[in-house]
Amino acid sequence: LCQGSNYSTCASCPSCPDRWMKYGNHCYYFSVEEKDWNSSLEFCLARDSHLLVITDNQEMSLLQVFLSEAFCWIGLRNNSGWRWEDGSPLNFSRISSNSFVQTCGAINKNGLQASSCEVPLHWVCKKCPFADQALF
């Protein structure tokens, strides 16, 4: 069940771990605390998930319903162009940097924002659901 890469489309699985929200075929974790981008990434990876990679405008719009004005880290970085952590380019939305240190991406209810990766922000993890919550 839900085998394969972190980034692959999940099958329709029954449930998500505690404190994770099921939406569509994925589980999402919206953090309460704040960390820098690298620490946020490590948090997600340690829980067999990844910093949020948004696949299309529809997913982005759906997720923004759950967001506030506060920015959250997502799996988006500028390495010679804005790319998601799965290696795919950002091609359904726009983000621009105002300074050379703004190389990580964040999201709030209004859209995407470039930021210095050092800024402590909330973050969003994404993973496939598990058949058995006890596995988490």
Epitope: F71, S97, N98, S99, F100, V101, Q102, A106, Q113, A114, S115, S116, E118, V119, P120
Partner: antibody, heavy 120, light 107 residues
Framework: EVQLVESGGGLVKPGGSLRLSCAAS????????MSWVRQAPGKGLEWVAT????????YYPDSVKGRFTISRDNAKNTLYLQMSSLRAEDTAVYYC?????????????WGQGTLVTVSS | DIQMTQSPSSLSASVGDRVTITCRAS??????LAWYQQKPGKAPKFLIH???TLAEGVPSRFSGSGSGTDFTLTISSLQPEDFATYYC?????????FGQGTKLEIK
């Protein structure tokens, strides 16, 4: 209310050293890049140094590189500028400045400045 | 390094006038430009970022425009408190360079 208060300016001889401080209040200091900008008497503004949130990255123009060192103490909400091998052309009012947030490196807030005079 | 050149260096105008100050970059800086106002003996005040976005609390008579290499700061109707020196600044990369300033004086 954001407040930046510089101190440590004064008269120093050429070749001497001085350390400026900037006490920050009214915001979460450890979330922002900080900078020093100076202004020689009757002249324009010149960027002097910028430091990242953690202090791990520092940036300088060629005019002060190797002579000035920017640092910060996030526990004390204080920014520093250590100046050495001072020259007459370093005479200026030195301003501490905070960025706009998220690494937006314009100078959104400024202190009142502290005067450094380099003269024999 | 990117050089910023302001014109004019000084300008005389009257209360109520519309005034435009120009800033030119030595190469394309897209919209990475800020404007500041400074009064004698005081610290600069942040006015505009990204060439046209007004900082919080800045009166709407101030506006910025331009992209690439040519930028303008416009004051639509000068008020007595607007007489000051204005600086532009490149804010994307190192070094963060300022223009030499434009002194706006009362005619």
């Amino acid at each position: 209310e954001v407040q930046l208060v510089e101190s440590g300016g004064g008269l120093v001889k050429p070749g001497g050293s001085l350390r400026l401080s900037c006490a920050a209040s009214g915001f979460t200091f450890s979330r922002y890049y900080m900078s020093w900008v100076r202004q020689a008497p009757g002249k324009g503004l010149e960027w002097v140094a910028t430091i990242s949130i953690s202090g791990g990255n520092t940036y300088y123009p060629d005019s002060v590189k190797g002579r000035f060192t920017i640092s910060r103490d996030n526990a004390k909400n204080t920014l520093y500028l250590q100046m050495s091998s001072l020259r007459a052309e370093d005479t200026a009012v030195y301003y501490c400045a905070r960025e706009g947030g998220y690494g937006n490196l314009w100078f959104a807030y400024w202190g009142q400045g502290t005067l450094v005079t380099v003269s024999s | 390094d990117i050089q910023m050149t302001q014109s004019p260096s000084s300008l005389s105008a009257s209360v109520g006038d519309r005034v435009t100050i120009t800033c030119r970059a030595s190469e394309n800086i897209y919209s990475a430009l800020a404007w500041y106002q400074q009064k004698p003996g005081k610290a600069p005040k942040f006015l505009i970022h990204n060439a046209k976005t007004l900082a919080e609390g800045v009166p709407s008579r101030f506006s910025g425009s331009g992209s690439g290499t040519d930028f303008t700061l416009t004051i639509s109707s000068l008020q007595p408190e607007d007489f000051a020196t204005y600086y532009c600044q490149y804010h994307y990369g190192i070094p963060f360079t300022f223009g030499q300033g434009t002194k706006l004086e009362i005619k």
